[in-house]
């Protein structure tokens, strides 16, 4: 039961999470101005990963799209790529988890199957939620080198009656909501990792037993039969026809891949 | 077509208050910024006040700031401007506009009506 | 707050003469986010209220005559009339619109030569 929980609120959180990180993405509030040195702008600038917008006080908002792709700066296409990198990861771990949910019976899978699933999206989200921080954070540390160097700028070469005002950006919305949703993601893949341990069933690591008949050596052996699924041993015992007789040594059990507990 | 019709003007004494209001009509008065401005006997144009369509955020010149408030009714396609402590120095013919949607310029201008402060 | 400077503060002209009136304001007025300008020109015909000619410094507000024409960038503007008409006399003004208090400039006055 807690597995169940634990595991379902690890896909929940997940959800949330990378719900988040698909909205951060597309958001155009990655960086807005700074009003700390004019508060009572009329004209107000924002920028996004895909485009900038400027709203004047009417409420008439215009966004032009980065047309460019090799004049942005390496910097702003590594932000993208991990974002994008993050949701696909994700995206994929959202789909393999809905598999991997105990609730959910698919066919005969089995337990052992649904834990190396849970165990695969929970790594998925974790690699998805640390990108999204990763990619938050990169521009956050562009926006702070830049804010201090356009500060320096906005003291300089004013020696003349003419001042001209510089635009400075600081954190947008769509930071804040990519570190949140970046965590939570991360937290929903620790817990989908945590759920995995408890569905991995307990098992106990017999030589196998081989029975001499006149006709087929039948033997027994935990683990010998292999999911078709392709996400690990069944870890029920099931008979296994072998043509000829074998020896001890040749039909023997071997550790399963959750040995780890 | 678009019409603004102010109205409230005449004589007050130095130190007291008027309210001013703007009549609009011919447009969605609710989705517009609307603007007072004024204009002193034989000077230029003072931008005296700016309410957004949604009555926040509010901005005034710094000459009226604590003295003057912009409001608006909606429902009633009104503007208002309550004008306190007054002083020789406000006399002036008032026009409200409207807030243009590019540009953040006045694009329809009421006739005006003519306050004047002396005792 | 941002001050706006007009000149010449008056300016004589026959009919179908070219002028050129100027405006200088005390900080730029470009936005970086759009590359626009938020400069407005207003024209005042005595005894009527203004009536909005320009805006971002060089768009025409639909209805304003081809002749008058906006144009420069940062702090220095002009407003340029091609061929100047009867009705064109009035006061000329310069806006602000970039950030509160929105500020005029004194005004061009067109008078008859």
């Known amino acids: 039961m807690a597995v169940t929980a634990c595991q379902g609120l690890g896909f929940v959180v997940s959800l949330i999470g990378i719900a988040g990180i698909i909205a951060a993405t597309c958001m155009d509030q990655w960086s807005t101005q700074d009003l700390y040195n004019n508060p009572v702008t009329a004209v107000f600038n924002y920028q996004g990963l895909w485009r900038s917008c400027v709203r004047e006080s009417s409420g008439f908002t215009e966004c032009r799209g980065y047309f460019t792709l090799l004049g942005l700066p390496a910097m702003l296409q590594a932000v993208r790529a991990l974002m994008i990198v993050g949701i696909v990861l994700g995206a994929i771990g959202l789909l393999v988890s809905i598999f991997a949910l105990k609730c959910i019976r698919i066919g005969s899978m089995e337990d052992s199957a649904k834990a190396n699933m849970t165990l695969t999206s929970g790594i998925m989200f974790i690699v998805s939620g640390l990108c999204a921080i990763a990619g938050v954070s990169v521009f956050a540390n562009m926006l702070v080198t830049n804010f201090w160097m356009s500060t320096a700028n906005m003291y300089t070469g004013m020696g003349g009656m003419v001042q001209t005002v510089q635009t400075r950006y600081t954190f947008g919305a769509a930071l804040f909501v990519g570190w949140v949703a970046g965590g939570l993601t991360l937290i929903g893949g620790v817990m989908m990792c945590i759920a995995c341990r408890g569905l991995a069933p307990e098992e106990t690591n017999y030589k196998a037993v081989s029975y001499h008949a006149s006709g087929h050596s039948v033997a027994y052996k935990p683990g010998g039969f292999k999911a078709s699924t392709g996400f690990g041993s069944n870890t029920k015992n099931k008979k296994i026809y072998d043509g000829g007789a074998r020896t001890e040594d040749e039909v023997q059990s071997y550790p399963s891949k959750h040995d780890y507990v | 077509d678009v019409q603004l019709v102010e109205s409230g003007g005449g004589l007050v004494q130095p130190g007291g208050s008027r309210k001013l209001s703007c009549a609009a009509s011919?447009?969605?008065?609710?989705?517009?910024?609307m603007h007072w401005v004024r204009q002193a006997p034989e000077k230029g144009l003072e931008w005296v006040a700016y309410?957004?369509?949604?009555?926040?955020?509010?901005y005034f010149t710094d000459t009226v700031k604590g003295r003057f408030t912009i409001s608006r009714d909606n429902p009633k396609n009104t503007l208002f401007l309550q004008m306190t402590s007054l002083g020789s120095e406000d006399t002036a013919v008032y026009y409200c506009?409207?807030?243009?949607?590019?540009?953040?310029?006045?694009?329809?201008w009421g006739q005006g009506t003519s306050v004047t402060v002396s005792s | 707050d941002i001050v706006m400077t007009q000149s010449p503060s008056s300016l004589t002209v026959t009919a179908g003469e070219k002028v050129t009136l100027t405006c200088r304001s005390s900080?730029?007025?470009?936005?970086?986010?759009?590359?626009?300008?938020?400069l407005t020109w207003y024209q005042q015909i005595p005894g009527q209220p203004p009536k909005l000619l320009i805006y971002?410094?060089?768009t025409r507000e639909s209805g304003v005559p081809d002749r008058f024409t906006g144009s420069g960038s940062g702090t220095y503007f002009t407003l340029t009339i091609s061929s100047v008409q009867a009705e064109d006399l009035a006061v000329y003004y310069c806006?602000?619109?970039?950030?509160?208090?929105?500020?005029f400039g004194s005004g061009t006055k067109l008078e008859k030569k």
């Open positions: 506009a409207r807030s243009s949607y590019y540009g953040n310029s006045m694009d329809y």
């Open positions: 971002w410094a060089s």
């Open positions: 309410i957004t369509s949604g009555n926040s955020p509010i």
């Open positions: 806006q602000n619109a970039y950030s509160y208090p929105f500020t």
């Open positions: 011919g447009f969605t008065f609710s989705t517009f910024g």
């Open positions: 900080q730029s007025l470009l936005n970086s986010g759009n590359r626009k300008n938020y």
